[in-house]
């Protein structure tokens, strides 16, 4: 039986690396307590259709990230997009699939917005 996916390292990026005095890009090892889970995350902005990555790296134990193998943002048009996932370097690729609000069906089906991939 396959166990849950362990996150041991994530892609790291910080657009504000100079101001924050961190590395700009690389691979971040995710250490932690044995009873805590670690995740990878990505945050980005959509500036007039252009994707601008803000941050990527390791994310602390968060139930909202449990058992997510893919990094997917599901909120509809946030100002800052966020996704998290479990598994080594799972934040290398991220996407946006907004969850459709459940409403009364209409005669015109709604086409989901296309995802964005890094």
């Amino acid at each position: 039986i396959l166990g849950r996916s362990e996150t041991q390292e994530c892609l790291f990026f910080n657009a504000n690396w100079e101001k924050d005095r961190t590395n700009q890009t690389g691979v971040e090892p995710c250490y932690g307590d044995k009873d805590k889970r670690r995740h990878c995350f990505a945050t980005w902005k959509n500036i007039s259709g252009s994707i601008e990555i803000v941050k990527q790296g390791c994310w602390l134990d968060d139930i909202n990230c449990y058992d997510r193998t893919d990094c997917v943002e599901k909120k509809d048009s946030p100002e800052v997009y966020f996704c998290c996932c479990e598994g080594n370097m799972c934040n290398e690729k991220f996407s946006y699939f907004p969850e459709m609000e459940v409403t009364q069906p209409t005669s015109n089906p709604v086409t989901p917005k296309p995802p964005y991939y890094n």
Epitope: K19, C30, K55, L60, D62, N64, P78, E79, Y81
Partner: antibody, heavy 120, light 107 residues
Framework: QVQLVQSGAEVKKPGASVKVSCKAS????????MAWVRQAPGQGLEWMGI????????SYAQKFQGRVTMTRDTSTSTVYMELSSLRSEDTAVYYC?????????????WGQGTTVTVSS | DIQMTQSPSSVSASVGDRVTITCRAS??????LAWYQQKPGKAPKLLIY???SLQSGVPSRFSGSGSGTDFTLTISSLQPEDFATYYC?????????FGGGTKVEIK
Amino acid sequence: QVQLVQSGAEVKKPGASVKVSCKASGYTFTSYNMAWVRQAPGQGLEWMGIIRPSVGSTSYAQKFQGRVTMTRDTSTSTVYMELSSLRSEDTAVYYCARVSMYAPEPMDVWGQGTTVTVSS
Amino acid sequence: DIQMTQSPSSVSASVGDRVTITCRASQGISRWLAWYQQKPGKAPKLLIYAASSLQSGVPSRFSGSGSGTDFTLTISSLQPEDFATYYCQQAFSHPWTFGGGTKVEIK
């Protein structure tokens, strides 16, 4: 257990400098960052900056740029915050706080605070 | 700098009451939000990180929600030890900033 122990209260004259220490124990010193936060009497919390003990790099709030210096001594697991050109508005309790190296970087352990009084 | 606005600035409540505190960021901060509790003469204590994750050892009556610009801290059933001041704080970009605080007082 994880602990941050800060140096004792200080009384300083305007124009002087103060150096507050924060000694860490109970965890691997270089595996966490350290922030400094201050609180003026009856006021809210104000973030001053952060130091990354593993490499010694610092990032300061613009408000304190040029007046604050954060350093660390890995041999004693101690971080220091020095504030110069003190004025009466710097009278506050100064806290060090351990910061996770990983996002979203919460401050999970705090020192007991050091009261700094600036008075002529 | 990102401004954090907390409301209300104070609230009077009784033991057993449900208390809700809100925090609004001047721009989107995704889930880079923490909540702290501070009692007079003491250092702040971390309650919630990542907007909704409960810090180890914190009672489950505390919960957080929200994302983007609007966040909420809820105490489901106020206990005598919960009378304190609560602060929200963003760590999305430097300088990290705090809300002005919400004092929870005994009615």
